[in-house]
């Protein structure tokens, strides 16, 4: 879905590439081709990332940090690239690169500022606290600290609660909002400005529906246009609340259009599904089946929650017996 | 133009120290590599050694590892090489030299007019 | 170390003549030899990098050849102001080493 990396030109012979955690990158240099190319890639000026000359590599004196991690494109120095091919970023690896190239003709210098993000996918999780209901919008890895927006019913709220927690490389965040008696909608939003990545989660509460024993009960789920695309892969599940945790009743794949299904009494809509309708049919209704209904459709860049509330009252003959 | 001139060669008894300098100017002296070459009276040439454009890593001919010493400052565009331990088979003209690039090629584009050194007691 | 063994040691000419001098190195060297010209009283001036690249401003009556072990520098026409010692130097490795020199005298 990303790009390697991106280059930001700045003045004075000096780039910025913004790379991801883990992935691989590219630091640009080139220079006028011409003969007895010599190439040395240092970092913050003191530690030697990759020497090459007389045609070859020479990585005796390369710092550890970078054994087996870097590589020339061997085959376009004669072409005047002397761009370092550098694997498996990490936030240490942050900071000002300098590449050095000589030949016969002149000695030029270039700097590249690498930064490194990290954006792991987001969630956006309801929770019953004992009588309470929450929202709660969290990113396991992020770096640099994200921008965290709440709005409710598409109005910012101030209220933004953040539990960090920082480690050697990245933070954690959590950020919870108390929606107890809310029928509002929620929207949270997760911005990553380096990477330039934006995550958002949205939460819709449905009216309650009250249906009777041994009925059916069809549950509403369409994502919303301006976050969904078809194109994209996404995931859809359906849980019940029970006891406080939600127990999953089916799940669809749109990269490989699986369903998997564990209620038996549940059931969807083929055709609807591939109008992106995800809207599902719980039959032969019974009391203990009361509750929350939860839709999740979730990718990488958002996560769309709607929730339904189920009241499954007993049926005239049920209550007669009774 | 290109110009390295030598300076701090004499008369010196065996034994003793000797420091050398090279001044350059007319290139950018951060960029390139810089050795020291020397010449016996009425023989050949012999590389000393090398520090490169950086002052990350220098080299030196086994005849005078752990005696000799290259440093640069690139502030100045100054060379060195500190001569200890000095010996009468280190009598010679010592010539400082640019090195193609950063040092790493190994050998000489521009040479200095060279400094004579004596040992002798 | 790499030995490098010039030859001739000394060699006498005249004025129009192809002369060819010879480098040998104890063990492969690639392509990385260099020639250098010292004229008397003079410091060295480099001839010929890369067994066979001529150094800018150096005349195109000097050319050089080989690779692995044999070297060798040709001046197609001798000129007058050629009488200078001709030094070959390896730099395949650490440390780097010249020849004797060869001596090139004017008849």
């Known amino acids: 879905i990303f790009p390697l990396a991106f280059f930001i030109y700045v003045p004075m012979n000096e780039q910025i590439v913004i790379g991801r955690l883990d992935e691989d990158i590219i630091l640009p240099s080139s220079f006028e081709r011409g003969s007895e190319v010599v190439i040395h890639w240092k970092y913050q000026d003191s530690y030697k990332v990759h020497s090459y000359y007389k045609g070859s590599d020479h990585l005796e004196s390369q710092d550890p940090r970078y054994a087996n991690r870097t590589s020339l494109f061997y085959n376009e120095i004669q072409n005047g690239n002397a761009s370092l091919f550098f694997r498996r970023v990490s936030l240490l690896d942050e900071g000002i690169y300098t590449c050095y190239v000589g030949t016969a003709i002149q000695v030029i210098t270039n700097k590249v500022v690498l930064k490194v993000g990290v954006f792991l996918t987001p969630v956006m999780k309801y929770e019953k606290r004992n009588t309470n209901s929450f929202l709660i919008c969290s990113v396991l890895s992020v770096y640099p600290r994200p921008i965290i927006t709440w709005k409710m019913d598409n109005t910012p709220i101030s209220e933004n609660n953040m539990e960090e927690t920082g480690s050697l490389d990245s933070f954690s965040i959590n950020s919870p909002l108390n929606i107890t008696g809310s029928n509002s909608s929620y929207e949270c939003t997760i911005e990553n400005s380096l990477l330039k990545q934006t995550w958002t989660g949205r939460w819709t509460m449905k009216d309650g529906l009250h249906k009777m024993q041994s009925e059916h009960v069809s549950l509403s789920c369409q994502p919303v246009n301006d976050y969904f695309s078809p194109n994209q892969d996404f995931k859809v599940t359906w849980s019940r609340m029970k006891s406080g945790t939600f127990s999953v009743l089916a799940y669809y794949l749109s990269s490989s259009q699986n369903t998997i299904i564990n209620e038996s009494r549940f059931s969807w809509n083929k055709e609807l599904i591939n109008q992106s309708d995800f809207s599902m049919n719980l039959m032969d209704l019974n009391l203990s089946d009361s509750g929350e209904y939860l839709c999740n459709i979730s990718s990488d860049e958002y996560t769309l929650l709607t929730i339904h509330t189920v009241h499954v009252e007993p049926s005239q003959e049920t209550a007669s017996h009774n | 133009q290109v110009q390295l001139v030598e300076s701090g060669g004499g008369v010196v008894q065996p034994g003793r120290s000797l420091r050398l300098s090279c001044a350059a100017s007319?290139?950018?002296?951060?960029?390139?590599?810089i050795h020291w070459v020397r010449q016996a009276p009425g023989k050949g040439l012999e590389w000393v050694a090398v520090i490169w454009y950086d002052g990350s890593d220098k080299y030196y001919a086994d005849s005078v590892r752990g005696r000799f010493t290259i440093s640069r400052d690139n502030s100045k565009n100054t060379l060195s090489l500190q001569m200890n331990s000095l010996r009468v088979e280190d009598t010679a003209v010592y010539y400082c030299?640019?090195?193609?690039?950063?040092?790493?090629?190994?050998?000489?584009?521009?040479w200095g007019q060279g400094t004579l050194v004596t040992v002798s007691s | 170390d790499i030995q490098m063994t010039q030859s001739p040691s000394t060699l006498s000419a005249s004025v129009g003549d192809r002369v060819t001098i010879t480098c040998r190195a104890s063990q492969s060297i690639s392509s990385w030899l260099a020639w250098y010209q010292q004229k008397p009283g003079k410091a060295p001036k480099l001839l010929i990098y890369?067994?066979?690249s001529l150094e800018s401003g150096v005349p195109s009556r000097f050319s050089g050849s080989g690779s692995g072990t044999e070297f060798t520098l040709t001046i197609s026409s001798l000129q007058p102001d050629d009488l200078a010692t001709y030094y070959c130097?390896?730099?395949?490795?650490?440390?780097?080493?010249f020849g004797q020199g060869t001596k090139l005298e004017i008849k």
């Open positions: 030299a640019r090195d193609r690039s950063s040092g790493a090629m190994g050998y000489f584009v521009y």
């Open positions: 130097q390896q730099y395949n490795s650490y440390s780097y080493t």
């Open positions: 890369k067994a066979s």
């Open positions: 007319g290139f950018t002296f951060s960029d390139y590599g």
